[in-house]
């Protein structure tokens, strides 16, 4: 497993159930880089942190997946968690 994947999983596992639900909803509308598709809503809403990490990495690869995860965390007001995720990714 890659460092970025571990960092994404760590961040998502640190969210409360309510925050994880909000994360998924924001992920459905977060601005994406050109050329990237959106994870289908139906698949997304039932996922736990582990499944969601796998889906983020498979859709966006590790580097962009970590950046996107950090941005959604920022959109949720979780800037410190976002900074920790990016620091872990760039170690």
């Amino acid at each position: 497993m890659g460092r970025a994947r571990d960092a994404i999983l760590d961040a998502l596992e640190n969210l409360t159930a309510e925050e994880l639900k909000k994360f998924k909803l924001k992920l459905l509308s977060v601005p994406l880089r050109e050329g990237y598709g959106r994870i289908p809503r139906g698949a997304l809403l039932s996922m736990d942190a582990l499944d969601l990490t796998d889906k983020l990495v498979s859709f966006y690869l590790e580097t962009y997946g970590a950046e996107l995860t950090a941005n959604v965390l920022r959109d949720m007001g979780l800037q410190e968690m976002a900074a920790a995720l990016q620091a872990a990714t760039h170690q």
Partner: antibody, heavy 114, light 107 residues
């Protein structure tokens, strides 16, 4: 349009404390503005779970709390000096992305004077 | 802490002029920059968020651009009601920080 309700003015003595209130929702920020100066972020609180973040500059003097039952955010400012005379705004972040402050209260003017 | 530097500090202009306000972040803040308008004795109002997204109800003469460290607010044809202070702010990292503001005044 969401209206954030804040009381208008507070007059307090040096060394005393004041508790400011704001009827709000979601993430509520507190921002200080001295006369003729820029904006300074004090901190924020999430009304749904009580999660807080502070600007270290204000951590010793500001305490952010929430009363969920009335959807009211509070900031208690303690050991006040003349430097703390300012308008204190509350603001919400309701836009889904980029976490801007999209709704602002009208501000509470705090005057510290003996 | 991320420092937001705004310039110029003030601008004197005529109605109908094109205005460019600048904001520079001390480190990369992606697109996490907002612009606020504040008129005397009023609370700030959100104009632009995410560097370039116009907030609901904001006239299209206001345009935001930039990313990373350099950001611009452009007013294509300034109106009398636009004379105010303009603040940029970043929401990329805590503590959230603002620039010192730019004051738009009439010539």
């Amino acid at each position: 349009q969401v209206q954030l309700q804040q009381p208008g003015t507070e007059l307090v003595k040096p060394g005393a404390s004041v508790k400011l209130s704001c009827r709000a929702s979601g993430w509520t920020h507190w921002v200080k503005q001295r006369p003729g100066q820029g904006l300074e972020w004090i901190g924020n609180i999430n009304l749904s779970n009580g999660r807080t973040n502070y600007n270290e500059k204000f951590r010793a003097m500001a305490t952010l709390t929430v009363d969920k039952s009335s959807s009211t955010a509070y900031t208690q400012l303690s050991s006040l000096t003349s430097e703390d005379s300012a308008v204190y705004y509350c603001a919400n972040s309701m836009v889904p992305h980029f976490f801007p402050m999209d709704y602002w209260g009208q501000g509470t003017s705090v005057t510290v004077s003996s | 802490n991320i420092v937001m530097t705004q310039y110029p500090k003030s601008m004197s202009l005529s109605i109908g002029e094109r205005v460019t306000l600048r904001c520079k972040a001390s480190e990369n803040v992606g697109s996490y920059v907002s612009w606020y308008q504040q008129k005397p004795e009023q609370s700030p109002k959100l104009l632009i968020y995410g560097a370039s997204n116009r907030y609901t109800g904001v006239p299209d003469r206001f345009t935001g651009s930039g990313s990373a460290t350099d950001f611009i607010l452009t007013i294509t044809s300034v109106q009398a009601e636009d004379l105010a202070d303009y603040h940029c702010g970043q929401s990329y990292n805590y503590p959230l920080t603002f620039g010192a503001g730019t004051k738009l005044e009439l010539k």
